[in-house]
């Protein structure tokens, strides 16, 4: 079952996905695609990273976090109802069938007619430096093995009512999180 995330038309949608690099610079390729994760790769790729950089992206899709430290959460800019659906975050761990696949369901709600302050704000505007930490959860080993030890955490909703920017680090445990050891 997919984890569900919500956004309003015209907002930026946020789909969290994380991993912890085994060592600084030891990055793992990641792809984001529209539609559930297939057996291999991502279907309808909207963004891709390699061992070094973001090497492919399409309009409105970008990484606001620091992908070099494992924050590969996807931001979709100025969403419309057509952006609703399943998105796949695939962490392409070396080795046969080692990839970790996360299906995240994005539900787009119509914008409120009356322009009024809303508590469900664009996270980027509210916390422009959030989600740049190296992660929470156990991780000890320093090299990629052929069968990595992986911890998964999936929490059903992203906190919508952040009262304090210090809670931003807690969001690191929301969504899809793995460690690579």
């Amino acid at each position: 079952s997919e984890v569900e995330y919500r956004a309003e038309v015209g907002q930026n949608a946020y789909l969290p996905c994380f991993y912890t690099p085994a060592a600084p610079g030891n990055l793992v390729p990641v792809c984001w695609g529209k539609g559930a994760c297939p057996v291999f790769e991502c279907g309808n790729v909207v963004l891709r990273t390699d061992e070094r950089d973001v090497n492919y992206w399409t309009s409105r899709y970008w990484l606001n976090g620091d992908f070099r430290k494992g924050d590969v959460s996807l931001t979709i800019e100025n969403v419309t109802l057509a952006d609703s659906g399943i998105y796949c975050c695939r962490i392409q761990i070396p080795g046969i069938m080692n990839d970790e696949k996360f299906n995240l369901k994005l539900v787009i709600k119509p914008a409120k007619v009356t322009p009024a302050p809303t508590r469900q704000r664009d996270f980027t505007a509210a916390f422009p430096r959030m989600l740049t930490t190296r992660g929470h959860g156990p991780a000890e080993t320093q090299t990629l093995g052929s069968l990595p030890d992986i911890n998964l955490t999936q929490i059903s909703t992203l906190a919508n009512e952040l009262r304090d920017s210090r809670l931003a680090n807690d969001l690191r445990d929301s969504g899809a999180t793995i460690r690579i050891g």
Partner: antibody, heavy 125, light 108 residues
């Protein structure tokens, strides 16, 4: 204010080892990578390696592999560097330096925004 | 390995002069170039990051420019406290960093 407090100067004999520390304060230790940099007397700076304090993952400059070992103690927010099989070539000032926050997806690397005061190592018989 | 070459090695100036320090990379490093100042017996201090981005607390007389392989640190109207050694550092090959050899700024 962010501070990186390094251990004091040391005088050691050739062949010995030395372990120096870098204790941080006023920021979350596990949220920033920690670099170590060597400065030989009157010379430029050499990057030794970087450690992720969160999981202990280390990446070294090839030149310092086998010479330097980087570790951390999360409970005390302290980074350590041990230098082994010391020779006169290892006489230098060693700095710990924090990786700055990321700047944006179009940039690959980081600057070093806070530095320790340095630990002077003298190797002499 | 990306090699950074700084020039001149030494620059003798009078307070009030405006100066430019050069840092040249052996290959294109985009904007991943940072400048540091080191005064005698002190630690390096970050002056400019990503070629031209200013740092909080650093006087506005320091500015940086350049992209690709050629970079410049400019000091508008040098003050006595500015004398010391200036290093450039590239982070394009992150996490493998390299530094330039330094430019010594001294009083004429």
């Amino acid at each position: 204010e962010v501070q990186l407090q390094q251990s004091g100067p040391v005088l050691v004999k050739p062949g010995a080892s030395v372990k120096m520390s870098c204790k941080v304060s006023e920021y979350t230790f596990t949220d920033y990578y920690m670099n170590w940099v060597k400065q030989s007397h009157g010379k430029s700076l050499e990057w030794i390696g970087v450690i992720n304090p969160y999981n202990g993952g280390v990446t070294y400059n090839q030149k310092f592999k086998g010479k330097a070992t980087l570790t951390v103690d999360k409970s005390s927010s302290t980074a350590y560097m041990e230098l082994s099989s010391l020779t006169s070539e290892d006489s230098a000032v060693y700095y710990c330096a924090r990786d700055a926050d990321f700047h944006g997806n179009s940039y690959v690397g980081y600057a070093m925004d806070y530095w320790g005061q340095g630990t002077s190592v003298t190797v002499s018989s | 390995e990306i090699v950074l070459t700084q020039s001149p090695a030494t620059l003798s100036v009078t307070p009030g002069d405006s100066v430019s320090l050069s840092c040249r990379a052996s290959q294109s490093i985009s904007n991943d170039l940072h400048w540091y100042q080191q005064k005698s017996h002190d630690s390096p201090r970050l002056l400019i990051k990503y070629a031209s981005q200013s740092i909080s607390g650093i006087p506005s007389r320091f500015s940086g420019s350049g992209s690709g392989t050629d970079f410049t640190l400019s000091i508008n109207s040098v003050e006595t406290e500015d004398f010391g050694i200036y290093f450039c550092q590239q982070s394009h090959s992150w996490p493998q960093y390299t530094f330039g050899g330094g430019t010594k700024l001294e009083i004429k």
